[in-house]
């Protein structure tokens, strides 16, 4: 589509909007330069333009007034001072703080088990067809129908450990080499992204805080895609994670361990497993091409079965097919040998909501995958709204500033390895890198966190989930531990190999810069959000894996062209930025181009067009709903909710009245309630301190 | 009670061919297999081969492919065995007995048997 | 072909006296084999199956042992009505053989 939006005549400036290092202090922007990012083209009143979307490699001049939108907030108090109460207010202040502190881990505990519960939909909608996936024989063969398998197969049970947990499974059956698994690993890592660039979504009601809370969910996305790119040739051309993995495993002599610690499971299982319980065992044996698993519900219903072990008369083609030559006779027609069966019976229910509804998985898949969305949106809007409010002034800065500031020279290099060390840590103890990254998200969009600082963590969580599996490849039986082992050990390797291109040398750290562009072009065309996710997670993948099934020939016929035309826009870009002159003049902009080669604009104007119908009712949806109507509607007052709809009517008779931005307001909470967002509320009596 | 019953004595041609019986009574025709077992002073005893009447299936001993044909008529509850270009070797004592011990070859129930002869 | 050997053709035996007979098997046959006795001018009848289970209505003075390629009947306390002769038989494989008997006779 669009080399990248809106680029004009547009003349490049390598000198502007280059990144700093990581942890970089940024100053707060200046209320007098505010820009306005309401987005109303057609209002009458006076108002700053909206910034252009830059992109990472093409650096632009742009008026000196226009601070840098990847500038943090400045959460500023606008409450009494705690020396200026009286006992009184004091004692009211410390319960209103711990009443939110017990309210943000309430709505902390159901955005986990949201996320839990979005997983298991996700597996019921497209759980055995993930399964199908696996069962291509292609896969050994193709390294890149592997990948774009694993990509697919995460995406579609939303959970690493099941889709790498069936990779250990088939190659504990031998149905799988380790060499075909590598691929299947990596794409696994890149569909684990997927779970945060969906939470960032939810946040799309203010421009600002989804432009950080995109990007900074997307740059766990652009890391997995560009280690990919990377080690994925490596990786078929010297074999390395193979090799290294296979020296590890046959080094040691491993016993068996202990299971992995489950420590947020067993807060959350309790009440996950009240909404539904799953048999994963399903996935992985319809993977391995088991038959009867294909008819089989993923909703668990049993949940205490006995199991008895009895040997039973079978009937066999002939004698070659007996257990045992000893058990091996015939009634003179048939040959018949004695079998082991496990007779499963089934003695106690599970306790579930879908446990005698007897509904089939893709009617309680999208029931849950609804109503975790639901819940998903709603736990992160009042955890926003929550963090708003204690963040601010002292505590804001003294969290601002221990979270975002870096050790004092020379020492400062470290300070990203610590906060990928943090990463790694916080991932192992919730256990999952889904959770951790979600629950990172909003915080790097009402500006918490600095992407710089994200980036790290979030290399950290990749880590982090691979130890996981590595203490899982531990405990597993004897027949699976070397392969299960030698899968994690792959994993974790293929993301030490990723953070030492990625992370060390502050030039290489793309990931920052491609999250920052896509953050400001989806920050102005709110659709191009979701077009990104169903592009990266769904259209490509999918793409790839019909041209495999196609055979090698298509494959490279087609993808040839397209990876020369991806470097020859690439190589042009660059030498637009870097050496214009040496292109000849037509070539030194892209207005050779139509504008729906260049542009988005053209684009949103058809999105505008499909989603037009909405924009009269977007905002009339309830609170939760609403965020959601404006990602399609791009509805500029969309989070007002009450008065939204008289507003939009009086809008399209030329009378609309500007909304501040949230920056021009002391802070957050009272920037949402002037739009509308929460019920205002005397600020005097706002809390400032837990 | 499970009975079998086959001709006393039949005596052949060689060259010629003989069809013998076994008439049952006492159980359901269909469930169990019908074995034929040849004995002969020299040779001991030979199993020939079953037959299971529920489906017709057959089930022969490779030296006795081609002599022995099996059938069973299900409407008469009874097994039939027919020997084709009999010689003087073929002269012995042909028994017809099924197995109710379902599952197994070990036969429980006989018939008395039919003595074959062959002779000019 | 299963061949099943017995060795002894004939046995001779007093009344009271604990019997064996044995039957070796040319390859391993599990435990499908079945014993049965046949007096003269009558047809055979099933004392043991499966190596050691005995048949309905069969004394229990009637036993089968063994596994595998060796066989043994016993006749713990030898009866008159007893004197017939035993064979053994294997069902472990197509086509089913029979051993060629073991006559018990009175010394």
């Known amino acids: 589509m669009a080399p990248w939006p809106e680029l004009g005549d547009a003349q490049p400036n390598p000198d502007k909007y280059l990144e700093g290092a990581a942890g970089q202090q940024p100053t707060a922007p200046d209320k007098s330069k505010e820009t306005n990012k309401t987005d109303n083209t057609e209002a009458p009143v006076t108002k700053i333009e909206l910034l252009p979307s830059y992109s990472t490699a093409t650096l632009i001049d742009e008026p000196t007034e226009v601070d840098d939108p990847w500038n943090l907030p400045t959460l500023q108090d606008s409450g009494i001072k705690w020396s200026e109460r009286d006992t009184k207010g004091k004692i009211l202040c410390f319960f209103q703080g711990i009443g939110r502190l017990i309210l943000l881990l309430g709505f902390l505990y159901f955005f986990v088990c949201s996320l839990d519960i979005l997983s298991s939909a996700f597996q019921l909608v497209g759980g055995k067809m993930a399964g199908q996936f696996f069962s291509n024989s292609s896969i050994m063969s193709n390294p890149l129908l592997g990948l774009v398998i694993g990509v697919l197969v995460t995406v579609l049970v939303q959970s690493s450990s099941t889709s790498t947990s069936i990779v250990v499974s088939m190659v504990s059956s031998s149905l799988l080499t380790v060499r075909a698994a590598i691929p299947i690993i990596m794409g696994a890592n890149i569909g684990t992204s997927i779970t945060n660039t969906i939470v960032a979504l939810m946040q799309v009601g203010d421009r600002s805080e989804f432009r950080r809370a995109f990007a900074g969910a997307t740059v766990h996305d652009f890391f997995n895609w560009l280690s990919v790119l990377v080690l994925l040739p490596v990786e078929v051309a010297t074999h390395y994670l193979e090799i290294i993995t296979q020296l590890i495993v046959e080094s040691f002599h491993f016993k068996n361990g202990e299971d992995a610690p489950d420590l947020l499971k067993v807060i959350t299982k309790p009440f996950t497993k009240l909404i539904v319980q799953l048999d994963k065992k399903v996935i992985s044996q319809i993977a391995m091409n088991d038959e009867k698993a294909k008819n089989k519900s993923l909703v668990k219903i049993w949940c205490k079965t006995f199991t008895n072990k009895t040997q039973i008369n079978v009937t066999v083609p002939s004698t070659a097919n007996c257990t045992s030559p000893s058990l091996c006779w015939t009634d003179g027609i048939q040959n018949w040998t004695m079998k082991n069966v496990t007779y499963k019976e089934n003695i106690a229910k599970c306790q579930h909501i879908f446990v005698n509804f007897h509904l089939p998985d893709l009617a309680v898949g999208t029931i849950l995958l609804i109503l975790s969305l639901l819940v998903l949106c709603g736990c992160l809007i009042m955890i926003v709204k929550i963090l708003g409010s204690v963040l601010k002034g002292q505590v804001a800065t003294v969290i601002k500033k221990t979270i975002n500031t870096d050790f004092p020279f020379p020492f400062a290099w470290l300070t990203g390895y610590l906060a990928i060390l943090v990463g790694a840590g916080m991932t192992f103890i919730v256990q999952s890198s889904s959770v951790f990254t979600s629950a990172l998200t909003p915080l790097i969009g009402i500006g918490v966190i600095t992407i710089e600082r994200a980036y790290p963590l979030t290399l950290g969580s990749n880590i982090g989930t691979t130890t996981t599996a590595i203490l899982a490849a531990l405990a597993s039986p004897g027949n699976a531990l070397r392969s299960s082992l030698q899968i994690a050990l792959c994993h974790f390797f293929f993301n030490i190999s990723g953070i030492l291109l990625w992370y060390p040398i502050p030039f290489t750290r793309l990931p920052i810069r491609m999250a920052k562009g896509l953050g400001n072009i989806s920050a102005k065309y709110r659709w191009f959000a979701v077009f990104y996710l169903i592009i990266f997670f769904f259209l490509i993948p999918l793409t790839v894996f019909g041209l495999s099934l196609a055979g090698w020939r298509v494959l490279v016929g087609v993808g040839v062209p397209v990876v020369f035309i991806i470097i020859l826009v690439l190589c042009l870009r660059l030498l637009q930025s870097r050496c214009p002159r040496v292109l000849p003049k037509k070539l030194q902009n892209w207005n050779f181009l139509p504008l729906w080669m260049r542009s988005l604009k053209p684009w949103d104007a058809v999105v505008s067009k499909f989603t037009g119908c909405f924009q009269m009712r977007c905002c009339c949806c309830c609170r939760v709903c609403c965020r959601a109507c404006c990602l399609l509607c791009d509805c500029p007052k969309c989070c007002r909710c009450s008065k939204c709809c008289e507003d939009l009517e009086e809008a399209q008779e030329g009378q609309d009245v500007p909304v501040k931005a949230p920056e021009t307001f002391d802070n957050i909470t009272i920037s949402r309630e002037a739009q509308g967002e929460v019920p205002a509320s005397d600020s005097k009596t706002e809390c400032t301190a837990l | 009670q499970v009975q079998l019953q086959q001709p006393g004595a039949e005596l052949v041609k060689p060259g010629a061919s003989v069809k013998m019986s076994c008439r049952t009574s006492?159980?359901?025709?269909?469930?169990?297999?019908m074995h034929w077992v040849k004995q002969t002073p020299g040779q001991g005893r030979e199993w020939i081969g079953a037959?299971?009447?529920?489906?017709?299936?057959?089930s022969y001993n490779q030296k006795f492919k081609g002599k022995a044909t099996l059938t069973a008529d299900k409407s008469s509850s009874t097994a039939y065995m027919q020997l084709n270009s009999l010689t003087s070797e073929d002269s012995a004592v042909y028994y017809c007995?099924?197995?109710?011990?379902?599952?197994?070859?070990?036969?429980?129930?006989w018939g008395q048997g039919t003595s074959v002869t062959v002779a000019s | 072909d299963i061949v099943m050997t017995q060795s002894h053709k004939f046995m001779s035996t007093s009344v009271g006296d604990r019997v064996s007979i044995t039957c070796k098997a040319s390859q391993d046959v599990g435990t499908a084999v079945a014993w049965y006795q046949q007096k003269a001018g009558q047809s055979p009848k099933l004392l043991i199956y499966?190596?050691?289970t005995r048949h309905t209505g069969v004394p229990d003075r009637f036993t089968g042992s063994g596994s595998g390629t060796d066989f043994t009947l016993i006749i713990r306390s030898l009866q008159s009505e007893d004197l017939a002769d035993y064979f053994c038989q294997q069902y472990s494989r197509i086509p089913l053989t029979f051993g060629s008997g073991t006559k018990l006779e009175i010394k």
């Open positions: 037959i299971y009447p529920g489906s017709g299936d057959t």
């Open positions: 007995s099924i197995s109710t011990i379902i599952t197994t070859g070990a036969v429980d129930y």
């Open positions: 006492g159980y359901t025709f269909i469930t169990y297999n």
């Open positions: 499966w190596t050691s």
